[in-house]
């Protein structure tokens, strides 16, 4: 009869292990070993037992004892099971962000392990498991479909395994993948909105604005605006779920025509944009050309009034005969042009819209000076103590300074109140002198004296 | 222009009769006076003759002083001078026609010295 | 009797420095008052007529105000070359007066 100890074996990969062969008589002719395992024999008194070190054991193995005797050959078998824990434990990538309301298919992948039958692999959300199952094939795959969901956000995916040796008198042995962090956003499908003028003139600044509702979570939200090749620069605001990104644009002269005005809104791994013109244009105000700003009374004076070569003028109300950037018209100066405006105002169509630019010139007519009876009155009578204002008015531009004198040598006070007195009777030689002339005219003042009975 | 000449040296109790000769205008249009001061005294204001050749003076100068005109000059005549007349004397075109160009045609003063 | 008073008959001014030069009229001349700058050796020079109107040529710095019987002559920003004795003259009336002149404001600019 043989026997081996010990009967079953459970060791890690690349262990050794002590096994014992015995028989039952004393003296067998022959006892060994059979396995295919690196052996060494353990040298002990007797003939009856043998010990062997098996060394480097890989995978699962039944070594032999066999032993005869005279009564017969007899063997019998030890049971050595090998564990490892898996070489590879892996989630499949998948892309970081996923949107809502989107499968999300997990799946774990296992190389190696064994015993299989104490190999499980579990898939869990933190440490919340969604799904365990035994490890099959080579390698195992354990797979499961979770519904994206806003409060996934950030939260970590990872696959385990457990190899279970505890009922062998061993541990529990658990190995984890890499996690993969799930971030999960809504873009709607409605493209961002975008206001922004829908034309601008050069060398001036507009504003645009680009906004959009309904996103998930916003702070990660990109927001890329650009005219044509020029990147904007925004300040973004954001509200729970939207934001609204305001930029200045600035045009030049080389930027004149039609421009793609474009926001790219980016989140996750998807986009939406919209795009929209914006007709850049040149347009200076008119010109109003006055052959002289300050002409002497009398004058001719032409007033022209040019614009850009597409634009509609009309000078002063009246529109260009042909219509088209160019009027004019002619004038005799007279006092009554003095301060007068001549307005030209100029009109473009730029992709659809009228543009409207005003330039006002203002004529200067030199006349006079003018001293009339109407404003002067020539003869003045006054009861002697009375108060007077003696009113005299001279015209002309520019203003004309006004003396009036007697003799030379005493004034008589214009727009003053005086008291009347002897010494004021008189003739007085009023001049009023500008740099256009000087006019004069005699102003008589007589002083009633008062009757006595 | 205005200029006046016949300044000098005089002795009290004499007679003077200062000129002013103008040039550019009309004596008819246009009213002179005279005006002097003393050595370290300020301006004083003598006389005037208007245009109609009407003549107004200063209270203490009546009696003491006569202005005539000529058609291109303007005489003062000192009376029975004494030092106190010791001056500078100017004479001024329309000092009370007070446009930008009023008093500002002053001639450039005779000195009168008053002296035994 | 359209007698003149001006004050004060002498003021020391900093160069930079702003003056003041008062002159009362003894009746009202209205707004008839004219102001010179005399230097000694050297014909009086024409400022200001109509109490607050500049005579061309004359710099900024000089200001007149005033009417009635009041009158004000400022210099602002005084020069050294604004050294000199400064008189007002009433311009309303020829008769019946003493002197249309002030007795005369001696500015020292130092």
């Known amino acids: 009869q043989t026997s081996v100890s010990p009967s079953k074996v459970i060791l890690p990969r690349g262990g050794s292990v002590l096994v014992t062969c015995s028989t039952s008589c004393d003296q067998p002719k022959l006892l060994g070993i059979e396995t295919p395992l690196p052996k060494k024999e353990l040298l002990l008194p007797g003939n009856n037992r043998k010990v062997y070190e098996l060394s480097n054991v890989q995978e699962d193995s039944q070594p032999m004892c066999y032993s005869n005797c005279p009564d017969g050959q007899s063997t019998a078998k030890t049971f050595l099971t090998v564990y490892w824990t898996p070489e590879r434990v892996e989630l499949a990538p998948l892309p970081s962000w996923q949107p809502v309301g989107k499968n999300l298919t997990l799946r774990c992948q296992v190389e190696g392990g064994a015993p299989r039958a104490n190999l499980t692999v579990v898939l869990l959300r933190g440490e919340k498991e969604l799904k365990r199952e035994p490890a099959v094939g080579e390698p195992a795959e354990v797979t499961t479909t979770v519904l994206v969901r806003r409060d996934h956000h950030g939260a970590n995916f990872s696959c385990r395994t457990e190899l279970d040796l505890r009922p062998q008198g061993l541990e529990l042995f658990e190995n984890t993948s890499a996690p993969y962090q799930l971030q999960t956003f809504v873009l709607p499908a409605t493209p961002p909105q975008l206001v922004s003028p829908r034309v601008l003139e050069v060398d001036t600044q507009g504003t645009v604005v680009c906004s959009l509702d309904g996103l998930f979570p916003v702070s990660e939200a990109q927001v890329h605006l650009a005219l044509g090749d020029q990147r904007l620069n925004p300040t973004v605001t954001y509200g729970n779920d939207s934001f609204s990104a305001k930029a200045s644009v600035s045009v030049t002269a080389e930027d004149e025509g039609t421009q793609r005005l474009t926001c790219a809104v980016i989140l996750g791994n998807q986009s939406q944009e919209t795009l929209q013109t914006v007709t850049i244009y040149s347009f200076p105000a008119p010109n109003v050309i006055l052959t002289k700003p300050e002409v002497s009374e009398g004058t001719e004076v032409t007033v022209k009034c040019e614009a850009h070569p597409r634009a509609k003028v009309t000078l002063n109300g009246v529109p260009a005969q042909p219509l088209g950037p160019r009027a004019q018209l002619l004038l005799k100066a007279t006092p009554e042009d003095n301060g007068r405006s001549f307005s030209c105002s100029a009109t473009l169509e730029v992709a659809g819209q009228l543009i409207h630019k005003n330039q006002t010139r203002e004529l200067r007519v030199l006349y006079g000076p003018r001293l009339d009876e109407r404003d002067c009155p020539g003869n003045w009578t006054w009861p002697e103590n009375s108060q007077q204002t003696p009113m005299c008015q001279a015209w002309g531009n520019p203003l004309p300074e006004l003396k009036c004198l007697k003799d030379g040598t005493f004034p008589l006070p214009i727009g003053e109140s005086v008291t009347v007195t002897r010494d004021l009777e008189g003739t007085y030689l009023c001049r009023a002198r500008s740099t256009q002339g000087e006019v004069t005219r005699k102003v008589t003042v007589n002083v009633l004296s008062p009757r006595y009975e | 222009s205005v200029e006046e000449s016949g300044g000098g040296l005089v002795k009290p109790g004499g007679t003077l009769t200062l000129t002013c000769t103008v040039s550019g205008f009309s004596l008819s249009s246009h009213a002179m006076g005279w005006v002097r001061q003393a050595p370290g005294k300020g301006l004083e204001y003598i006389g005037i003759?208007?245009?109609?050749?009407r003549t107004y003076y200063a209270s203490w100068a009546k009696g003491r002083f006569t202005i005539s005109k000529t058609s291109t000059t303007v005489d003062l005549k000192i009376t029975s001078p004494t030092t106190e007349d010791t001056a500078t004397y100017f004479c001024v075109r329309d000092p009370y026609d007070s446009y930008d160009d009023g008093y500002r045609l002053w001639g450039p003063g005779t000195l009168v010295t008053v002296s035994s | 009797a359209y007698d003149m008073t001006q004050t004060p008959a002498s003021v020391e001014v900093a160069v930079g420095g702003t003056v003041t030069i008062k002159c009362q009229a003894s009746?009202?001349?209205?707004?008839?008052l004219s102001w010179y700058q005399k230097k000694p050796g050297q014909r009086p020079k024409f400022l200001i007529y109509d109490a607050s109107k500049l005579a061309s040529g004359v710099p900024s710095r000089f200001e007149g105000s005033g009417s009635g019987t009041e009158f004000t002559l400022t210099i602002s920003g005084a020069q050294s070359d604004d050294a000199a004795t400064y008189y007002c003259?009433?311009?309303?009336?020829?008769?019946?007066?003493?002197?249309?002149f002030g007795g005369g404001t001696e500015v020292v600019v130092k």
């Open positions: 003759i208007g245009s109609s050749d």
């Open positions: 009746q009202s001349i209205y707004r008839y």
């Open positions: 003259q009433q311009a309303y009336s020829s008769g019946s007066i003493d002197n249309a």
